[in-house]
């Protein structure tokens, strides 16, 4: 996988009036490493690993750059015409990548009310607009505003990409994304019984890198895909990842099932606890992982945040 640096910014408007401030977070190699504190108006480390490795200068620089980007995004939102009443959002995702062959990529993507309306390649300055008439109108609105804005030149896009790559290289050198291996902690639980069946869930947590195989086996043989339910592999905020797999089995057949895990050349099988050792979860056995808001405003205002 290529090394990547990604910034996610969002500004909001209420009844046509653009709100002050903005929301932002940063990801390094898919891991959250930066969050923007809206109250203190500062970029802060996300997770102990970022805090330990990146110095104060990083957060000063990031604060300056994010403030500038946030202001740009707010100005862009003011130029989006026909904003109906209520709450609206404009989101920008900016990504730069360094691939194994040392080639680079850079792009940014804009979403209005959670809907993608413009993608730009920062290296070629090519733009892509989805087919929908709403996206076409929004893209035209925004690009027309940028044409009037002297800052939005090709030189500016190149500088944007160069700046992103420079940061990515600096962060990689400082060892934030050292390719260490952290083996997963695996734990198997059983949910309540219904109609003679139980749901067994196998959770792998605190592992790095993110590539993992997690599957249920019956008598040593992998169950078919359609009998298993997988969760996404998600960052857990500590520079490591978590995921799960679940399946339904007949009560009394626990001994036949094991959760098989393979990660970075290591593997293990984990049996279903049975009899007195059976771990019963509470009724809440839903496995949906919600994107936790960067800030309470997300939850309160139910804004869709694109990862």
């Amino acid at each position: 996988e290529p090394h990547s640096l990604r910034y996610n910014l969002m500004v909001l408007s209420q009844d046509g009036s653009v709100q002050s401030g903005f929301l932002a977070e940063g990801h390094l190699d898919g891991q959250p490493f930066l969050r923007y504190d809206r109250q203190k108006r500062r970029a802060k480390p996300q997770g102990q690993w970022a805090e330990d490795v990146l110095g104060a200068k990083t957060w000063d620089t990031e604060t300056e750059d994010l403030t500038e980007n946030g202001q740009d995004l707010r100005r862009t939102l003011t130029h989006i015409k026909d904003q109906k009443g209520g709450l609206h959002s404009l989101q920008e995702i900016r990504v730069c990548e360094i691939h194994e062959d040392s080639s680079t990529r850079g792009s940014r993507h804009f979403y209005y009310d959670g809907e993608l309306f413009l993608s730009q390649n920062l290296e070629t300055q090519e733009s892509t607009v989805p087919q929908s008439s709403r996206a076409q109108t929004l893209a035209m609105n925004v690009t027309n505003f940028w044409k009037e804005d002297a800052m939005k030149t090709k030189t500016h896009y190149r500088a944007m990409q160069a700046d992103c790559l420079q940061k990515l290289q600096r962060y990689l050198k400082s060892g934030v994304a050292i390719r260490r291996t952290v083996p997963p902690m695996v734990n198997v639980t059983c949910s309540e019984v219904s109609e003679g069946n139980i749901t067994v869930t196998c959770r792998a947590s605190s592992f790095y890198p993110r590539n993992i195989t997690l599957t249920w086996r019956q008598d040593g043989v992998s169950l078919s895909h359609n009998t298993q339910q997988w969760g996404d592999v998600l960052p857990d905020g500590n520079g490591t990842y978590q995921t799960w797999v679940a399946t339904r089995i007949r009560q009394g057949e626990e001994q036949r099932f094991t959760c098989y895990m393979e990660h970075s050349g290591n593997h293990g099988t984990h049996p279903v606890p049975s009899g007195k050792a059976l771990v019963l979860q509470s009724q809440r056995t839903d496995h949906h992982h919600h994107h936790h808001g960067l800030n309470d405003i997300f939850e309160a205002q139910k804004i869709e945040w694109h990862e």
């Epitope: 008598d219 040593g220 043989v221 098989y260 099988t269």
Partner: antibody, heavy 118, light 107 residues
Framework: EVQLQQSGPELVKPGASVKVSCKAS????????IYWVKQSHGKSLEWIGY????????VQNQKFKGKATLTVDKSSSTAYMHLNSLTSEDSAVYYC???????????WGQGTLVTVSS | DIQMTQTTSSLSASLGDRVTISCRAS??????LNWYQQKPDGTVKLLIY???RLHSGVPSRFSGSGSGTDYSLTISNLEQEDIATYFC?????????FGSGTKLEIK
Amino acid sequence: EVQLQQSGPELVKPGASVKVSCKASGYAFTKYNIYWVKQSHGKSLEWIGYIDPYNGGTVQNQKFKGKATLTVDKSSSTAYMHLNSLTSEDSAVYYCATTDGYSLFTYWGQGTLVTVSS
Amino acid sequence: DIQMTQTTSSLSASLGDRVTISCRASQDIGNYLNWYQQKPDGTVKLLIYYTSRLHSGVPSRFSGSGSGTDYSLTISNLEQEDIATYFCQQGNTLPFTFGSGTKLEIK
């Protein structure tokens, strides 16, 4: 190439015990179960049980509980089946087998003939 | 325990023939049916798993079919090297059980 090499033939007296070995090679031993199967002379096959080499967990056919004990030695990638209190009924060829994770008894050992006779 | 019945204990056929060996389970085994070949020297090989999936390296002249309680193994073009005893086995319910075997001979 996956290979299961079993120990040689055994001639044992009634009441004695025997330990059949199955040395695995060509794959990561702790990844896949080892299964044991019995074939009495001129008869069909009977599943005895299996062991998960990673954690030593076993699942057995009730019929063979108390008769067969399954163990592994991870350091030598070898599975063992210990048969006790032998009688003429235990005279048979015993096979070990393993899986590729997709099918049962995917690869088989060559079999070990155990003869119980006074 | 689930009983696996192979009614034909031995079968004679000529080289090039299409041969079908059947196997019946005493209850529905939901396609968890495997076929094994045992050569006269005792060597055992997996041929087909999950009713119809051909194990890697097994010639395509072997095929399997069936559902519920009735299953079959077909050899489309019998060759000399196919002379062996064929066993079916269910993997649906413990204990795993095998059929009594069908010995295939050349006419």
